[in-house]
């Protein structure tokens, strides 16, 4: 569900919404962080009908969200973060 | 007090079209994702299909996906369905259900008493 | 998607006894389940949301727990307004209900 990629590509998110998804229409979370081509962190969002969305980093629903899905994968619940480096 | 308030339901022929409505009041609507439930004569209950605060972002289970449109009218405090190419399958009681708010402890909380679809020659 | 395997499909029970009822997950639904009541010609009522939580007005004598992929609904001592039908939903993934338990009296 959270995916997490260092890339040097420049920014992806062109807007951001803070507009609350229901983690049960979320298929997966792709977090990228500041560096190299971007200045800020970006977050993006697959949902289920097929459509993406980049989310807000400070809005307050995804941060919660993320930490659950932290602690879930950090109790060793079927919830994997994925860590991947590309080049 | 909450109210949810289905109208629309009736006899269509397989193929013919049919459009839903919920009216809805003692809550603010456009604070809510919202859902259709449906329910076959003696059957248990099915998910149908769910909409987003401003009608922006819906879902809808596979076996509808092509001809149901959920859709809302916040002005209106109203929810609808609209259903095309319908099959037998498809006759149900048909509710409409509150589905989501930011926390979630609302999830399919209050629901309407329901309208009959059938769908016979 | 997920599956909900509901049991027993039905059950018969006399007023004062304690039921249970019992949902399986076919994945992890890490506790986003709710507990329905409804009876015949009604719309389901809520009794219990996220495993454990009971409904605003909801007697105590109904209860919820689980975990993981296994969940279950406690009635601790049956009264004559509880037989009816009781569905679990899953919210974990989309939406999927369980296919019902019909309670009976004995």
């Known amino acids: 569900v959270l995916e997490v990629y260092y890339t040097s590509l420049r920014c992806r998110c062109v807007q951001e919404s803070s507009v609350f998804i229901p983690r049960r229409f979320i298929d997966r979370i792709q977090i990228l962080p500041r560096g190299n081509g971007c200045p800020r962190k970006e977050i993006i969002v697959w949902k289920k009908n097929k459509s993406i969305v980049c989310v807000d980093p400070q809005a307050e629903w995804i941060q919660r969200m993320m930490e659950v899905l932290r602690k879930r994968s950090s109790s060793t619940l079927p919830v994997p973060v994925f860590k991947r480096k590309i080049p | 007090e909450v109210q949810l308030v289905e109208s629309g339901g009736g006899l269509v022929q397989p193929g013919g079209s049919l459009r839903l409505s919920c009216a809805v009041s003692g809550f603010t609507f456009s604070d809510y994702y919202m859902a259709w439930v449906r329910q076959a004569p003696g059957k248990g209950l099915e998910w149908v299909a769910s909409i987003n605060y401003d009608g922006g972002d819906t879902y809808y289970r596979d076996s509808v996906k092509g001809r149901f449109t959920i859709s809302r009218d916040n002005a209106k405090n109203s929810l609808y369905l609209q259903m095309n190419s319908l099959r037998a399958e498809d006759t149900a009681v048909y509710y409409c259900?509150?589905?989501?708010?930011?926390?979630?402890?609302?999830?399919?909380?209050?629901w309407g008493q329901g309208t009959l679809v059938t769908v016979s020659s | 998607d997920i599956q909900m395997t509901q049991s027993p499909s039905s059950l018969s029970a006399s007023v004062g006894d304690r039921v249970t009822i019992t949902c399986k997950a076919s994945?992890?639904?890490?506790?986003?389940l709710t507990w329905y009541q409804q009876k015949p010609g009604k719309a389901p009522k809520r009794l219990i949301y996220?495993?454990?939580i009971l409904q605003t007005g909801i007697p105590s004598r109904f209860s919820g727990s689980g975990s993981g992929t296994e969940y279950t609904l406690t009635i601790s001592s049956l009264q004559p307004e509880d037989f009816a039908t009781y569905f679990c939903l899953q919210q974990s993934s989309l939406y999927t209900f369980g296919q019902g338990t019909k309670l009976e009296i004995k």
């Open positions: 994945q992890n639904i890490n506790k986003e």
């Open positions: 996220n495993t454990n």
């Open positions: 259900a509150t589905e989501e708010d930011y926390d979630g402890s609302y999830v399919m909380d209050a």
